[in-house]
């Protein structure tokens, strides 16, 4: 009989849909179920999930979730982990190498660590070490080949040699940077006495009575003197190399910075003049910047004086520019001396020299000019006429004379005229007309008149406006237009209704809410009446709301 499998208790993992599947157990051989592994554990195939199979011998794999170790959990100073993988399975080993000058605890250049159930077997370690050094005229007093950090190695000089001041033995220490010094012994005849003195300078350290071969001593010069040559001398074969010279140099006086100042100026003033190589922080006044474009920087004393020679440069601000009818380019808001900025004029406007765009430059006293965009007029379209001049562009208030073609005129027999370039373009179009197309004065209308004084002659497309007398209603268009020598249909002025006291008394009525003796109403207006005191309506209720129709009103009656 086939042995069934009980519900699998997976260490560091679990079945997917565990609670639903629990009902199906025990399970028969041949059944498979998907399962997952917890963090830091994987299936034998290296995945975070797989299938667990019920077999004759129980569940397979027997260990469904294997421990993993991550390379990122390894901290190795002064060494490297091999790059083959980033995740390691239980019992897997990884190699590590120590950098030159470092070794494992056992003194090897490389080692290994293993992934165990609780993580890595150990943290890899690379310890600083020193090799057996090269001995000069000396020998080691011990036999080791490797020396750990802070280890001491004793050495002794060969006969006739000494390490220093007559000593024939000494020690060196293994430090972070290798051996503290080389185990060298010298022939005493190669030692040097104190280094030579120099004018206007001195050594940076107290002189000793004896210096070993290859010892170095540093010199420095007094203030206002510059060191020429190497600042070091070296002991060789009992003699010092050539010492440097201290040359007098030109100092820098207190810098008078135009449009700026040294920081802490008053405190620093007593220390001037100063030597070359000295640097001081300074700042620039408003509207000035350093050559680097900042408001502060360093000024340097050099052989040739202060650098920069012009510490504070003028700046110009875009906000100082007022441009009407144009635009300034948006590249920056602050411009340094001699920088140029572009501007352009809107259509209908031009620069003083007639271009669509121009430029201004930042000068010592500000912008070279205020950009200007002047109104201009293009050559207009001529109708039955021609220009009397050749220009293509005309500035504000410029005049352009024109003349009519033969058989055409402007008005009253005039054949020449002028137009003026104004804020809204040309004052009018340079148009000439065929005289047969002109009109005489517009027709008069009853109870109305034109709003302008009449002319004898009107050019085609001229418009004249009418208005009615008080209380008269205008019917139709209030304009007439001259076309092909004729005026269009004029409007009519419709009579108002005059409500008199006489007519109201006749009908025993009075105006409702008004005490007027005489009242004017326009066509279409409603007039409200009421009976006088002691009288009653003799006509319908509606008749007391009478409507004015072209001067006629039907009065209601009261008895």
């Amino acid at each position: 009989e086939v042995k069934p499998c009980d519900f699998p208790e997976i260490q560091h993992g679990g079945l997917y849909y565990k609670s639903l599947r629990r009902l199906y157990f025990p399970a028969a051989a041949g059944q498979s179920y998907s399962y997952y592994c917890d963090q830091n554990f994987v299936t034998p195939s290296g995945s975070y999930w797989d299938y667990i199979h019920c077999t004759q011998d129980g569940w397979s794999p027997t260990v469904p979730c294997l421990r993993t170790c991550s390379k990122s959990d390894v901290e190795i100073e002064n060494g490297f982990i091999s790059e083959s993988s980033s995740i390691y399975i239980l019992n897997e080993e990884t190699q590590y190498n120590c950098k030159p000058g470092y070794a494992t605890a056992e003194g090897n250049s490389s080692g290994s660590i293993t992934c165990l159930q609780n993580g890595w077997s150990t943290q890899p370690i690379c310890i600083k070490f020193c090799d057996m050094p090269v001995f000069e005229n000396s020998r080691a007093k011990s036999n080791g080949m490797w020396f750990k950090l802070h280890d001491t190695l004793d050495y002794e000089c060969y006969d006739g040699y000494e390490s220093s001041y007559g000593n024939t033995t000494d020690s060196i220490v293994c430090g972070e940077d290798g051996w503290s010094h080389l185990p060298t012994c010298y022939n005493s005849s190669e030692n040097c006495g104190p280094p030579p003195p120099i004018s206007n300078g001195d050594t940076t350290s107290f002189p000793q009575k004896v210096y070993l071969p290859w010892s170095r001593v540093e010199y420095q010069c007094q203030s206002y003197y510059e060191l020429q040559g190497s600042k070091y001398v070296t002991c060789s074969n009992g003699d010092w190399s050539e010492p440097p010279r201290c040359i007098s140099m030109k100092p820098c006086e207190f810098p008078e910075i135009q449009h700026g100042h040294l920081y802490y100026e008053n405190t620093r003033r007593p220390y001037f003049p100063v030597a070359t190589g000295q640097s001081y922080s300074y700042y620039c006044d408003q509207n000035f910047v350093t050559p680097s474009g900042s408001y502060w920087d360093y000024i340097h004393c050099t052989q040739d004086g202060w650098l920069p020679t012009v510490p504070c440069l003028r700046t110009c601000s875009k906000s100082d520019i007022e441009i009407e009818n144009g635009f300034i380019s948006e590249s920056s808001s602050i411009y340094i001396l001699n920088k140029e900025i572009q501007y352009k004029c809107k259509p209908g406007y031009a620069t003083a020299d007639g271009n669509s765009s121009g430029s201004i430059t930042c000068l010592q006293n500000g912008w070279s000019a205020q950009p200007i965009c002047i109104k201009f007029c293009d050559m207009p379209v001529f109708e039955n006429s021609r220009a009397k001049s050749n220009g293509m562009r005309f500035k504000l208030h410029d005049t352009l004379d024109y003349e009519c073609y033969d058989g055409y005129e402007i008005s009253y027999g005039n054949t020449t005229g002028s137009i003026v370039c104004g804020e809204d373009g040309w004052s009018h179009f340079p148009t000439c007309y065929n005289s047969s197309e002109k009109c005489g004065p517009p027709p008069p209308i009853s109870n109305g008149d034109t709003t302008s004084f009449l002319l004898k002659v009107y050019v085609p497309q001229s418009r004249v406006e009418y208005q009615c007398q008080s209380y008269y209603e205008l019917q139709g268009s209030n304009y007439v237009t001259c076309s092909n020598g004729e005026w269009s249909e004029p409007p009519r002025c419709i009579h108002p209704c005059i409500i008199t006291e006489e007519n109201m008394n006749k009908n025993n009525i009075q105006l409702k809410g008004k005490s007027d003796i005489k009242y004017y109403a326009k066509t279409g207006d409603t007039i409200e009446f009421m009976c006088k005191l002691g009288y009653n309506a003799n006509t319908s209720v509606l008749s007391f709301q009478a409507v004015c129709r072209e001067g006629i009103v039907e009065y209601p009656r009261c008895e």
């Epitope: 635009f327 380019s329 948006e330 590249s331 140029e340 572009q342 501007y343 352009k344 004029c345 809107k346 259509p347 209908g348 406007y349 271009n355 669509s356 765009s357 809204d424 373009g425």
Partner: antibody, heavy 114, light 107 residues
Framework: QVQLQESGPGLVKPSGTLSLTCAVS?????????WTWVRQPPGKGLEWIGE???????NYNPSLKSRVTISVDKSKNQFSLKLSSVTAADTAVYYC???????WGQGTLVTVSS | DIQMTQSPSSLSASVGDRVTITCRAS??????LGWYQQKPGKVPKRLIY???SLQSGVPSRFSGSGSGTEFTLTISSLQPEDFASYYC?????????LGPGTKVDIK
């Protein structure tokens, strides 16, 4: 008379970059600061994209600013438009023009489609 | 951004009619406005600049007026070649913006 001519691919893939060049002839690009790009989606109105001055400074439509670059090449007497991360909504006829004197290129249809 | 609105969005008219198109700006743009004409499949062409100045070579039947926020394009006597779409454009401030357009077709 100044003439403008657009050139560039008529088909661009979604999320790609639209690149057009406008060659200026009959005048110098340094004579104006009004070199402009405008577009018109099929059957719709005109939209101002941006412009460049001949010194290279620019003004862009804020609705496109993060995607648009207009540059000028004085040595070749031309200016160009680059529009990145395009979608079907960028399908349009693209016009280059000199706004001040109203000189227009003939326009080029750019379709964004895979 | 400055919003530009145009009215009407379309209109039908006959040859010889007087046609008026209005453009409104969401804020004062002085007289920094242009009017453009575009015929189907063609490049736009400026008719008016600075609100009322006639572009060189444009017939005088086209005129522009207005200042501030209200602007008008007038065609005094519509001609057959004037059937097209018309756009207003403000160039007072960046970004430049256009109206949605007015289509003028034959009645």
């Amino acid at each position: 008379q100044v003439q403008l001519q657009e050139s560039g691919p008529g088909l661009v893939k979604p999320s790609g970059t639209l690149s057009l060049t406008c060659a200026v002839s009959g005048g110098s690009i340094s004579s104006s600061n009004w070199w402009t790009w405008v577009r018109q989606p099929p059957g719709k109105g005109l939209e101002w994209i941006g412009e460049t001055y001949h010194d290279g400074s620019t003004n862009y439509n804020p609705s496109l600013k993060s995607r648009v670059t207009i540059s000028v090449d004085k040595s070749k007497n031309q200016f160009s438009l680059k529009l990145s991360s395009v979608t079907a909504a960028d399908t349009a006829v693209y016009y280059c023009l000199e706004f001040y004197f109203d000189y227009w290129g003939q326009g080029t249809l750019v379709t964004v489609s895979s | 951004d400055i919003q530009m609105t145009q009215s009407p969005s379309s209109l039908s008219a006959s040859v010889g009619d007087r046609v008026t198109i209005t453009c409104r700006a969401s804020q004062d743009i002085r007289n920094d406005l242009g009017w453009y004409q575009q015929k189907p499949g063609k490049v736009p062409k400026r008719l008016i600049y600075a609100a009322s100045s006639l572009q060189s070579g444009v017939p005088s039947r086209f005129s522009g007026s207005g200042s501030g926020t209200e602007f008008t394009l007038t065609i005094s006597s519509l001609q057959p070649e004037d059937f097209a779409s018309y756009y207003c454009l403000q160039y007072n401030n960046y970004p430049f913006t256009l109206g949605p357009g007015t289509k003028v077709d034959i009645k």
